[in-house]
């Protein structure tokens, strides 16, 4: 349903924001070494790339119940 789609998207966005903030906070507490700066840049760039990817999606994702089954039924026909 539309509501489930919106809920899933909202959850994913919230999760990514939280994960990014947690990673940034952790990195900011690390001494400003070159390695820490590179790592923080990677997190920022990675999150931007993910947002860029989702923005290219024009249609709504199929819901999880409508994807391939975990256990496949016996095949009725062979090629």
């Amino acid at each position: 349903s539309e509501a489930e789609d919106a809920s899933l998207l909202s959850f994913m966005q919230g999760y990514m924001k939280h994960a990014t903030k947690t990673a940034k906070d952790a990195l900011s507490s690390v001494q400003e070494s070159q390695v820490a700066q590179q790592a923080r840049g990677w997190v920022t760039d990675g999150f931007s790339s993910l947002k860029d990817y989702w923005s290219t999606v024009k249609d709504k994702f199929s819901e999880f119940w409508d994807l391939d089954p975990e256990v496949r039924p016996t095949s009725a026909v062979a090629a």
Partner: antibody, heavy 114, light 112 residues
Framework: ELQLVESGGGLVQPGGSLRLSCAAS????????MRWVRQAPGKGLEWLSS????????SYADSVKGRFTMSRDNAKNTLYLQMNSLKSEDTAMYYC???????WGQGTQVTVSS | ATMLTQSPGSLTIVPGESASISCRAS???????????FYWLLQKPGQRPQLLIY???NRESGVPDRFTGSGSGTDFTLKISGVKAEDAGVYYC?????????FGQGTKLEIK
């Protein structure tokens, strides 16, 4: 042996209604979401609708939204497609298939004509 | 809707030779779940469609290993090695990543 057998097709006038059925056997019907797909004469395949395994959620193609209703009776291992306000462009072979297009029925022909 | 464009529209193959069919999607078919819900189906003359390949490269049970699916993102290929007479029919690509679910227009394979 796994089987999907459609029935209920036929000739109907524009504006009329039909109810298609798909009897499933040989697998645990209640564990799988199901789909209806149609194929107009000499044309390709078109997904119409999907229904969750417990029947609680459905989704539809824009071409049939508001006119077709998909449902299921897990106690009877049967899938349904109620088709209302039929148009000539709904003339096609109608197939039921399980999630992932793994298995298909033999199809039932629907012809909408005056 | 996500468009799937198959090429060629038709091809004629001598038995024993190889055939290749391409399918291009109008956007990446990687689902938020991380998998790519892309399929190849075959409809033999006068018959129902049948699934050959699921999730890009997995052969459905009972499908001969001469059928191989490959690709990623937006570009996918079905290769049939050592074509046999019974491989004749219309091949469709399909995607289940997005709603509405869509199919390619079909590629007709004829055997010489």
């Amino acid at each position: 042996e796994l089987q999907l057998v459609e029935s209920g097709g036929g000739l109907v006038q524009p504006g009329g209604s039909l109810r298609l059925s798909c009897a499933a056997s040989g697998f645990t019907f209640s564990s799988y979401s199901m789909r209806w797909v149609r194929q107009a004469p000499g044309k390709g395949l078109e997904w119409l609708s999907s229904i969750k395994s417990d029947g609680s959620i459905t989704s539809y193609a824009d071409s049939v939204k508001g006119r077709f209703t998909m449902s299921r009776d897990n106690a009877k291992n049967t899938l349904y497609l109620q088709m209302n306000s039929l148009k000539s462009e709904d003339t096609a072979m109608y197939y039921c298939t399980n999630q992932g297009y793994i298995n298909w029925g033999q199809g039932t022909q629907v012809t909408v004509s005056s | 809707a996500t468009m799937l464009t198959q090429s060629p529209g038709s091809l004629t193959i001598v038995p024993g030779e190889s055939a290749s069919i391409s399918c291009r999607a109008s956007q990446s078919l990687i689902h938020s779940a991380g998998k790519t819900y892309f399929y190849w189906l075959l409809q033999k003359p006068g018959q129902r469609p049948q699934l050959l390949i699921y999730q890009v490269s997995n052969r459905e049970s009972g499908v001969p290993d001469r059928f191989t699916g490959s690709g990623s993102g937006t570009d996918f290929t079905l290769k049939i090695s050592g074509v046999k007479a019974e491989d004749a029919g219309v091949y469709y690509c399909a995607q289940g990543t997005y709603n509405p679910k869509t199919f390619g227009q079909g590629t007709k394979l004829e055997i010489k």
